[in-house]
Amino acid sequence: YDFTNCDFEKIKAAYLSTISKDLITYMSGTKSTEFNNTVSCSNRPHCLTEIQSLTFNPTAGCASLAKEMFAMKTKAALAIWCPGYSETQINATQAMKKRRKRKVTTNKCLEQVSQLQGLWRRFNRPLLKQQ
């Protein structure tokens, strides 16, 4: 999906009002310096591409993020504010339903959510100095 035509300000508002708090709740008890940055993004569409990938694509050691509250709210925000996004996700959602797994918060998942926090911060904070 090409995120170029999303309403970035509306997505930013959704992040600030709820998604950010859900991410903090998920990470509670984890030191903010525990994980180094291993993923970045270079503009708002790119950030959303990487956020979608980390949030909804199962990875080795962390297959359970899509059912988390922050993930469901992320999905809702993208569906509302990115034209045509919902249609592209129907097949992916059906495949995910077949893959229901026991919910376990692994260290790998914590690391992945830490990376998500960094991506969302970049999405919301273009460089302080535009030079």
Partner: antibody, heavy 122, light 108 residues
């Protein structure tokens, strides 16, 4: 463990070519801008070239423009520097370095390789 | 093209504060990054975006930037701080990375 490992350095005659490679591991390579920086013996750091996260744009220092080419293969997590028409003044340790970017602005080099030595001598 | 000027050398007594400057035209409008390089090693980022510090760098390292001068401050200097220090900016007008000439810090 996030790591950059350079290879391909060596001794080469003036006018000849050399290809440096940089293997990335431990991070999502495709999301970072990548640079080459060099350091002549006993001298300071000199930036050489940059390539955007998606490979869509490159830029070079005036001293290497037209002779060096930076490329990347995001599927293999590798960065390359093709160096043609080498001169004695290109003798240096060559480092690859990772840099987050925002649009067309590059941020700090937060991860560096250990460097590979290139000596141009007849 | 944009030029960054650093003093070639700075000395500090153990336990004292060292200040390394980086001069550039209206540098305060740019984000300045600082690197430490010890002999035979690759550079290491110690301060980025003027004053932020990577999690692995001790609090003794700090930075500031305004007007035409950026400053790296190293408090409670230690023998292990002896190294070359480089400032760096991204010059968006020319799409070039610019490094200062480097400053050799000696802990007396």
């Amino acid at each position: 463990q996030m790591q950059l490992v350079e290879s391909g350095g060596g001794v080469v005659q003036p006018g000849r070519s050399l290809r440096l490679s940089c293997a990335a591991s431990g991070f999502t390579f495709r999301t970072y801008g990548m640079h080459w920086v060099r350091q002549a013996p006993g001298k300071g750091l000199e930036w050489v070239a940059v390539i955007w996260y998606d490979g869509s744009y490159t830029h070079y220092a005036d001293s290497v423009k037209g002779r060096f080419t930076i490329t990347r293969d995001n599927s293999k997590n590798t960065l390359n520097l093709q160096m043609n028409s080498l001169r004695a003044e290109d003798t240096a340790v060559y480092y690859c370095a990772r840099s987050p970017q925002w649009e067309d602005i590059f941020e700090a080099f937060d991860i560096w390789g250990q460097g590979t030595m290139v000596t141009v001598s007849s | 093209s944009y030029v960054l000027t650093q003093p070639p050398s700075v000395s500090v007594a153990p336990g004292q504060t060292a200040r390394i400057t980086c001069g550039g035209n209206n540098i305060g409008s740019k984000s300045v990054h600082w690197y430490q390089q010890k002999p035979g090693q690759a550079p290491v980022l110690v301060v980025y975006d003027d004053s932020d510090r990577p999690s692995w760098i001790p609090e003794r390292f700090s930075g500031s930037n305004s007007g035409n001068t950026a400053t790296l401050t190293i408090s409670r200097g230690e023998a292990g701080d002896e190294a070359d220090y480089y400032c760096q900016v991204w010059d968006s007008s020319s799409s070039l990375v610019v490094f200062g000439g480097g400053t050799k810090l000696t802990v007396l």
